[in-house]
Interface confidence: low
């Protein structure tokens, strides 16, 4: 997880993850797991679902426990290296009855000079060197091969590319006399794919290319790419699709205008601009093609790359983003928020919302909150009553369905969600949060109330009475 | 294993006091908001009282104000609901229940302790 | 307060049909998106328990015979097939507001 978390969240929620849908039929959800031999054409994955399903059930006292672990490779091609020169790698998970791969790109924030990259040398060394990588991770979220914990992907081929470049996975330079560090962010991504291909991802049907903060905005940079690069090779069959979790970000004005010193306090746009030029890196060519010589700093950000993008990306984007609010300087520690603060947070949550209006596949919860998709509890957030795993299945079928991606959802399986209400935590389903000095759980009023949240104020906004307002909030809603 | 469990029921005459408890085990206690509810011999579910986690939100069921109050120990994992005034439409079987953070629903029920108000 | 209207009060099913259970709110119990209404099975001599939550999600443990449905004032809870050990009291729940209400219960009986 990423710079100063304001809020600490529980790794699992109270709420059990919704249950487990296998595909279902005509826009239903699938109810039980009885075995449906005439499903069996064209959703292999179903299928073994309910055999897996059906095998579980058969030996629930079985200690053959199938090993859920990712194990790491490191790139034979030993000159695409993170910033130190260590060779760079992923963590693999084969599924062989799977066609489905799932390379998830970590994320960690960046450096963009000297002193911050040396700074997060000293104190993140994981981030920027292989050395000391343990040999096998295991598999959360949507990288999980548990149905329970994974309804969506449980099947496929798991693929972890740790984050060692620092560059938001965009830079293309090596380490030399020249560059104390390399960036090779983009290169790392090629280099796998490339040895994916002799491990099987040459029968692939589909290939997700996913990643939460820095890696989900590497995601919106290199998806047309990877597709680029498997076209190129001989595999134009394999369907490139990309899914960015909290890496939708804003070149919005900061709350309180700061210096460039270090990264959580330096403008994005500040950040992108100086960091573009230190990692010589590298953005999707069609976008770089809109903005003149000196501006690719623009195609960092979702709203301005994503129109440019062949590929059919999914956004998933907290719409209180605690990322976002750190580099904006939203701090929201020790003393209440002004009411400055408060409407500047509530401005974000609009102004994201009107960037997702046109993004075709999005998940956004009106949540305060940073990354889902590999934490266990990204099952339990809905929006609108559809789960995250429901809508990317729903985003799955729309493909299937025709061969380009439909642009209306079948009914009752939507896949652009994104929540309309007005406040952090108005959403019942956000993960829990935490006063960061007590580490107690704190209801919506509470957290409100922290916030220095003005009763009569928000229900004068909300053409409501205070009363009405309150016990809403006193009941946790 | 997640668990509640009620003690303090007893017979008691009318305009008289009592005092229930909820030892809490399994799960912290100090995270979760917590509720009374009770059930009439042969009738349904009614809420009494509800406490947020850190005893900042204390609320009551209209009949029940000025009569009861709900406190509770998070050092002590122990919620308390002291009775007095008390009649014998209050006869029931008491229940606490941890609330579910997200959506106000009572996720995990003690087994009840048994009020009798009367003569 | 919220007045939740149960129905039927009792019910009689065959082993293996459907039961269908309703519950009206007299104000809606839906915000943003969300229903605040959940159901409960309580067992003679038992205390309640969670089926499912916020309309239509099933708790932990629960089977997936059981589902929810519904939204601003009017909610159904389906239980199909029906079971013996289901013959018990169904009680659905709103936590729109401070005071949470119950429906005054329906009685399963199988046949």
């Known amino acids: 997880s990423e710079g100063r978390k304001t809020w600490r969240r529980r790794g699992q929620q109270p709420p059990p993850p919704p249950r487990t849908e296998a595909a279902p039929a005509a826009g239903q959800p699938v109810e039980s797991f009885p075995l449906d031999f005439t499903a069996v054409e064209g959703n292999m994955d179903s299928f073994m679902a309910q055999v897996k399903s059906l095998a579980q059930s058969l030996y629930p006292c079985s200690a053959q426990q199938l090993n859920e672990d990712l194990r790491l490779h490191l790139l034979l091609n030993t000159s695409v290296t993170c910033n130190d020169g260590s060779p760079a790698g992923y963590y693999l998970k084969e599924s062989r009855g799977s066609r489905r791969w799932l390379l998830f790109l970590e994320g960690g924030w960046y450096c963009f000079n000297r002193e911050n990259c040396d700074s997060r040398y000293d104190t993140m060394r994981r981030l920027m060197s292989s050395r000391d990588w343990p040999r096998t991770r295991t598999g959360t979220g949507i990288l999980s091969s548990q149905p329970e914990e994974n309804p969506y992907w449980w099947n496929a081929n798991m693929v972890f590319i740790p984050y060692c470049s620092s560059d938001v996975w965009s830079g293309a330079s090596s380490k030399s006399e020249k560059n104390e560090y390399a960036f090779m962010g983009a290169l790392i991504i090629q280099e796998v794919v490339r040895e994916l291909l002799g491990r099987g991802l040459s029968g692939a049907k589909v290939l997700l290319l996913a990643g939460s903060s820095a890696g989900g905005t590497g995601v919106l940079l290199n998806v047309d790419r990877v597709a680029e690069q498997l076209e190129k090779l001989g595999y134009p069959a394999i369907q490139v699709r990309g899914l960015a979790d909290s890496g939708w970000f804003l070149d919005n004005k900061q709350y309180r205008r700061s210096d460039c010193i270090d990264t959580i306090n330096c403008a994005p746009t500040d950040a992108i601009r100086r960091g573009i030029r230190y990692w010589s890196g590298m953005v999707p060519e069609r976008c770089q093609r809109q903005f003149k010589e000196g501006e690719e700093w623009n195609c960092f950000f979702g709203y301005k790359v994503y129109p440019t993008l062949r590929c059919p990306v999914f956004v998933v984007q907290w719409l209180f983003d605690e990322a976002q609010l750190t580099v904006d300087n939203v701090h929201l520690t020790g003393q209440p928020v002004q009411e400055g603060q408060w409407l500047y947070i509530q401005n974000l949550g609009r102004e994201l919302r009107g960037t997702l209006k046109d993004v075709q596949a999005s998940f956004a919860p009106a949540c305060l909150s940073h990354e889902i998709i590999i934490r266990s509890y990204w099952t339990d957030v809905q929006v609108k009553g559809t789960s995250l795993p429901r809508a990317l299945h729903c985003w799955d079928r729309s493909f299937h369905d025709s061969h380009k991606a439909s642009k209306t959802p079948m009914k009752g399986c939507p896949f652009h969600l994104v929540d309309s209400c007005p406040w952090p935590h108005c959403n019942p389903s956000c993960p829990t949060i935490r006063d960061q000095f007590t580490g107690q759980e704190m209801n919506v009023a509470q957290f409100l109330m922290h916030m220095g949240f003005d009763v009569q104020t928000v229900a004068q906004q909300q053409g409501m009475e205070p009363s009405k307002l309150l016990g809403m909030l006193s009941n946790g809603n | 294993e997640v668990q509640l469990v009620e003690s303090g029921g007893d017979l008691v005459k009318p305009g008289g006091s009592l005092k229930l408890s909820c030892a809490a085990s399994?799960?912290?206690?100090?995270?979760?908001?917590m509720h009374w509810l009770r059930q009439a011999p042969e009738k349904g579910l009614e809420w009494v009282a509800y406490i947020s986690s850190g005893s900042t939100t204390l609320s009551y069921a209209n009949t029940m104000k000025g009569r009861f109050t709900i406190s509770r120990d998070n050092a002590k994992k122990t919620l308390s609901l002291q009775m007095t005034s008390l009649r014998s439409e209050d006869t029931a079987i008491y229940y606490c229940?941890?609330?579910?953070?997200?959506?106000?629903?009572?996720?995990?029920w003690g087994t009840g302790t048994t009020v009798t108000v009367s003569s | 307060d919220i007045v939740l209207t149960q129905s039927p009060a009792s019910l009689v099913v065959s082993l293996g049909q459907r039961a269908t259970i309703s519950c009206r709110a007299s104000k809606s119990v839906s915000e943003s998106g969300y229903s605040y209404m959940h159901w409960y099975q309580q067992k003679p001599g038992q205390p309640p328990k969670l089926l499912i939550y916020l309309a239509s999600n099933l708790e932990s443990g629960v089977p997936a015979r059981f589902s929810g449905s519904g939204s601003g004032t009017d909610f159904t809870l389906n239980i199909h097939p029906v079971e013996e050990g289901d013959a018990t009291t169904y009680y659905c729940?709103?936590?729109?507001?401070?005071?949470?209400?119950f429906g005054s219960g329906t009685k399963l009986e199988i046949k």
């Open positions: 399994g799960f912290t206690f100090s995270d979760y908001g």
């Open positions: 229940a941890r609330k579910n953070y997200n959506g106000g629903y009572f996720d995990v």
């Open positions: 729940q709103h936590s729109r507001v401070l005071p949470p209400t």
